[in-house]
């Protein structure tokens, strides 16, 4: 007996298109052996017509399609444009076609339904709008013209010229009389319904001499695009709804259990708590289409997806629809780094942000997910020298460890970081990654002053004590600027007194800076490291001044000044909004945008999004 | 909601036929998949074929013990599905439930289905 399964029998109709999916024992051979799907001859024989290696006979050119879903055991053999010809005996399978490993799939295609002569058919999607077009002779043009549909044996007023609309039609059907020139009136139903489909006869005139023409019409309720992603990565839904919407709200909802479809998020304002963070709803276009990015998937977000357009932004009868099944790919190559990471007022983070190996060259960003109306990530901080502004000296991107991972470091924290931020590049959109920075009690590790003033030709030594923990970190002084930071050298001062209970192992590490100048002035940071993996920072401002008397400045942490006033926002800046944020190759024409403000920065409430991947600021 | 009656079940020798009908009502606009399982005394519920369709197009999936035997249909307009067994079998014999679904992944999967009816008995003298 064959592992294959899948359905023993298809019927389906001229003109249609059939999905047709394959189960098989998910064992790691079968995952990666040959898929295919061959008809049988009459001889025995079966003739491949699609395979997963990429073969497509001609007889399904453009028109078929076969895709692999190792992680679930399946593969879908996609045929459009089905006519007659295409009926007969298959068989899906793996491996090579006469061995076995195969299941008989009986596909019948008719011509359609039983349909009365001159029949016009109408084949339209689920939610949108159909015109039935009904002609008429001159000696019934005053007359009454009605629209009926054939429930059973009996005929059933639909609507018709003199008012009456059937109450199942309330509020989405009309019926238009064309100009004195035009012999035909028509019938628009709007926001169809799955029970819409059947049979109607329109008719203009009531006696023996009405004109009458019949017409099919079938409701298609949307196959589901499926979607494969890797856990961690992201997936983005284009949903194009058509122009006809462009004005109403918009959603994407998740089929839960039964008739449910719980909102994910919505051009309302509504978004679901379990995708706080890690959800845009891009701008829509003029013709009503629009875009969902999730990022940071998790295997409970595997599903059937719906994109829709209804006033109250949520799933109704009639709403257009565009439907996916997305499965999350466990077998993931996108790496595991921490979703929380946690750090205390003052001190610092140091968060590492995957990305696809394959493209160490792509220009890496690092961006802050804003969840006003729909979500927003303005762009802080790029690969290629662009801060924005008021993160200047506290905010670096760094290409280290390399290999896959960026590391990205914020300091002199506040409440107002926490927050939701997403790593990504303007190489493979899958590669976004989202990790929440949550701002907890404490005190920061290493001390060192507040601001610190240098004069120029002297010399300054500026302190920075390290704590016991880091007795086997690297410690570095380095001068921010916006490319990084570049290593100086630095003197071992021996043990701290900075902090209690602390052993020998503390250490005062010092930057000293001979005949100081004026291009010294700016941000400096001490930090620890291990290898190419960078622990906590703290950051001093030096400012120089002219000479006012002789001498070297030593700064003690008692003599340090109060740390500096917070930047005004800066006109020089960028903010890069959602639609960038689809297609990161935007972000290069972003750059010259001048003279924009950002919203002033309000608080943010952090959301735990319940990981158990946290890291905190010290650690990696 | 959607409500799923079983009717049709019975007592029959072996090597008669049956038909079994499940009847849908409520928000059944959605559903995308009608199936029977069935369920023997002391042993698990077991799939025995479903008819999943989009637009006209149905696909009627079944069990390997029940191929050539059992066939699966449904009625659009009625929201009904039927089975029909023919040459039935003692190890036939157990309750047949009726379920339906919104989403299906797996057909095979009871866990795939959202609503289920009260079953029917059937049972299969020799």
């Known amino acids: 007996k064959s592992p294959i399964f899948g359905p023993e029998e298809v019927n389906s109709v001229e003109g249609n298109s059939v999905s047709i999916t394959c189960y098989y024992p998910p064992t790691s051979v079968n995952r990666h052996t040959r898929k295919y799907w061959c008809r049988q001859g009459a001889r025995g024989g079966c003739i491949t017509l699609i395979s997963s290696e990429g073969y497509v006979s001609s007889k399904y050119a453009g028109r078929a399609n076969l895709t692999n879903f190792p992680e679930n055991g399946t593969f879908v053999v996609n045929i459009a444009q089905l006519s007659q010809d295409d009926s007969g005996r298959y068989k899906c399978g793996l491996g090579i076609n006469s061995r076995g490993l195969s299941f008989d799939v009986s596909l019948e295609v008719s011509q359609g339904p039983g349909l009365l002569n001159d029949t016009k058919v109408y084949t339209v999607d689920l939610g949108r709008t159909v015109t039935i077009n009904c002609p008429f002779k001159t000696e019934n043009a005053q007359k009454r013209k009605s629209l009926y549909k054939q429930i059973g044996l009996y005929p059933v007023l639909v609507i018709d010229s003199s008012g009456y609309v059937n109450p199942n039609y309330t509020g989405r059907i009309r019926l238009d009389i064309q100009g004195t020139g035009q012999l035909l009136f028509s019938v628009v139903i709007n926001q169809l319904r799955l029970s819409d489909a059947g049979q109607y006869l329109c008719q203009a005139g009531d006696d023996s001499n009405s004109n009458k023409k019949n017409a099919d019409l079938q409701v298609l309720k949307p196959e589901p695009e499926l979607v494969y992603e890797d856990l961690r990565g992201s997936v983005t839904f284009h949903c194009a709804l058509g122009p006809e919407v462009a004005n109403v709200a918009k959603f994407l909802c998740r089929q839960s259990s039964g008739e449910n479809c719980d909102v994910v998020v919505n051009t309302l304002g509504k978004r679901a708590p379990a995708f706080e963070g890690r959800i845009l709803l891009n701008p829509q276009d003029k013709d009503g289409s629009f875009s969902v990015v999730i990022t940071g998937l998790r295997k409970e977000d595997a599903g059937r997806y719906l994109c829709g357009a209804h006033s109250d932004g949520q799933l109704q009868e009639g709403s257009p629809i565009q439907a996916w099944q997305l499965f999350v790919n466990e077998e993931s190559t996108i790496p595991r780094s921490p979703t929380v990471v946690k750090g205390v007022a003052g001190g610092s983070v140091a968060v590492l942000c995957p990305y696809n190996r394959k493209e160490s060259k792509s220009i890496k960003y690092w961006c802050l997910w804003e969840g006003a109306q729909n979500g927003r990530c303005p762009l802080l901080v790029d690969s290629e020298g662009w801060v924005k502004a008021q993160y200047e000296g506290r905010l670096s991107l760094l290409e280290e460890p390399g290999n896959g991972t960026f590391t990205v470091i914020l300091n002199q924290l506040t409440s107002r970081d926490a927050g939701f931020y997403w790593c990504l590049t303007n190489g493979d959109t899958l590669w976004r990654t989202t990790v929440e920075i949550k701002i907890i009690e404490g005190e920061p590790n290493l001390k060192v002053p507040g601001n610190v003033t240098a004069v120029l030709g002297e010399t300054l030594k500026v302190p920075c004590h390290f704590p016991c923990k880091f007795s086997s970190y690297e410690k570095y002084w380095c001068k921010w600027n916006n490319t990084g930071c570049q290593a100086l050298p630095s003197q071992d001062e021996g043990p701290s007194k900075a902090f209690v209970n602390c052993d020998e192992n503390s250490r005062l590490v010092s930057l000293t800076l001979n005949l100081v100048t004026r291009a010294d002035e700016g941000w400096y940071w001490c930090g620890v490291k291990q290898g190419h993996f960078y622990g906590e920072t703290a950051a001093v401002y030096v400012a120089v001044e002219e000479r006012k008397a002789a001498g070297s400045r030593d700064v003690s942490l008692a003599k340090a000044d109060a740390a500096p006033d917070e930047k005004v926002l800066d006109s020089g800046f960028r903010e890069i909004e959602n639609k960038a944020i689809q297609d990161p190759r935007l972000f290069a024409e972003e750059k010259a945008v001048a003279d924009t403000r950002d919203q002033a920065d309000g608080s943010r409430a952090s959301v735990d999004s319940g990981s158990s991947e946290e890291q905190g600021g010290s650690s990696r | 909601e959607v409500q799923l009656v079983e009717s049709g079940g019975g007592l029959v020798q072996a090597g008669d036929s049956l038909r079994l009908s499940c009847a849908a009502s409520?928000?059944?606009?959605?559903?995308?998949?009608m199936g029977w399982f069935r369920q023997a005394p002391g042993k698990e519920r077991e799939f025995v074929t479903t008819?999943?369709?989009?637009?006209?197009?149905?696909?009627?999936y079944y069990a390997d013990s029940v191929k050539g035997r059992f066939t699966i249909s449904r009625d659009n307009a009625k929201n009904t599905a039927y089975l029909q067994m023919n040459s039935l079998k003692p190890d036939d014999t157990a309750v047949y439930y009726c379920?339906?679904?919104?989403?299906?992944?797996?057909?095979?999967?009871?866990?795939?289905?959202?609503?289920w009816g009260q079953g029917t008995q059937v049972t299969v003298s020799s």
């Open positions: 379920a339906a679904s919104t989403v299906l992944t797996d057909p095979r999967v009871p866990t795939e289905y959202d609503y």
């Open positions: 008819i999943t369709w989009s637009g006209p197009t149905n696909y009627k």
């Open positions: 409520g928000r059944t606009r959605t559903t995308y998949g």
